[in-house]
């Protein structure tokens, strides 16, 4: 039956994905598991087949409809059970009353390209990518640039606390290469996160001009 | 067959408290979650609050500070304790319960909550 130890965790991307992902101590690796999703208001039902991530854990991604499509609304809940197969049954492993707005998570941020550069800055943009029209411009970005010799992990983090698809860097150091990312969370959802990071974006200062004091 | 036998409902001024209640024909121990749902005349059915096997318990933002869901394993029974009502919430509520295996889900026969002056 439903097992205290196990965490079943889910996120809605604000358009037509729901993840999951569900860790339980002991779980049979060869059992067949599934999310099963149910709309309190909608006539549709949804499954997607759990696989293992980890030892014992395993993750999904319920897919309800066209990547735009907007699925679900602030006022939807969705019963998510965690079933996995016993003989010819699904048994309830996990289960949880989901409220799509309050546990947001946004696809990483998309099309980063260097608009201009110059020795000591630059300025960069983005696109944010299956976002839903709900939040208008209710939405905050991080970012952070990898200098040479450092980690990301290292590397100082940006705060733009409004919808602001673009980033003048500046204090740069001429002629080196740099890798930017940044990141996308709606300011609306109790238990809402951050997006994951976007795929780095390399660009390298223009030199500096000879003869001139940098 | 798991019976749900619903009680309470009926005609109730605005600002006005009732309570429902849900008595299943077995267990609901192992029931991995209960819920209320309701339907208003020409809208969608809605779910009011749910409460799981170990406690979780969720509520619709319309009815939240208003609503509270209870469940009373040894009288086999889940509460829907109803304060401050609104016309906005007259509607069929029903009862529903999720068992331990997906083909189990349960409801109870509805009953209509009027809330008028």
């Known amino acids: 039956a439903v097992n205290g130890t196990s965490q079943f965790t889910c996120f809605y991307n604000s358009r037509a994905n729901i993840s999951c992902v569900w860790s339980q101590d002991g779980a049979l690796q060869d059992t067949s598991c599934q999310v099963h999703a149910w709309p309190d208001r909608r006539r549709w039902n949804q499954t997607c087949e759990l696989l293992p991530v980890s030892q014992a854990s395993w993750a999904c991604n319920l897919i309800l409809g066209a990547p735009d499509s907007q699925k679900l609304t602030t006022v939807d809940i969705v019963t998510l059970r965690v079933l996995c197969r016993e003989g010819v049954r699904w048994r309830v492993m996990a289960i949880q009353d989901f409220k799509p707005f309050e546990n947001l998570r946004l696809m990483a941020p998309i099309s980063l390209q260097v608009v201009h550069v110059e020795t000591h800055r630059c300025n960069i943009s983005w696109e944010i990518s299956q976002a839903s029209h709900y939040f208008e411009r209710h939405l905050e970005f991080e970012a952070r640039t990898l200098s040479p010799g450092h980690t990301w992990e290292e590397a100082p983090l940006l705060t733009l606390k409004q919808k602001q698809e673009w980033i003048c860097l500046e204090t740069l150091t001429p002629d080196t290469q740099y890798e930017f990312q940044v990141r996308v969370k709606p300011l609306q959802g109790e238990f809402t996160t951050w997006s994951p990071w976007s795929q780095p974006l390399a660009f390298r200062t223009k030199p500096a001009a000879l003869g001139k004091d940098t | 067959q798991v019976q749900l036998q619903q009680f309470g409902g009926g005609l109730v001024q605005p600002g006005g408290s009732l309570t429902l209640s849900c008595v299943a024909s077995e267990s609901i121990s192992e029931m991995s979650r209960m819920a209320w749902y309701r339907q208003a005349p020409g809208k969608q059915r809605e779910l009011v609050a749910s409460i799981t096997m170990h406690g979780g318990v969720v509520y619709a933002d319309a009815v939240k500070g208003r609503f509270t869901i209870s469940r009373d394993n040894t009288k086999n029974t889940v509460y829907l304790q109803m304060n401050s009502l609104k016309p906005e919430d007259t509607a069929v509520y029903r009862c529903?319960?999720?068992?331990?295996?997906?083909?189990?889900?349960?409801w109870g026969q509805g009953t209509l909550v009027t809330v008028s002056s």
């Open positions: 529903n319960a999720l068992g331990t295996w997906s083909d189990e889900t349960y």
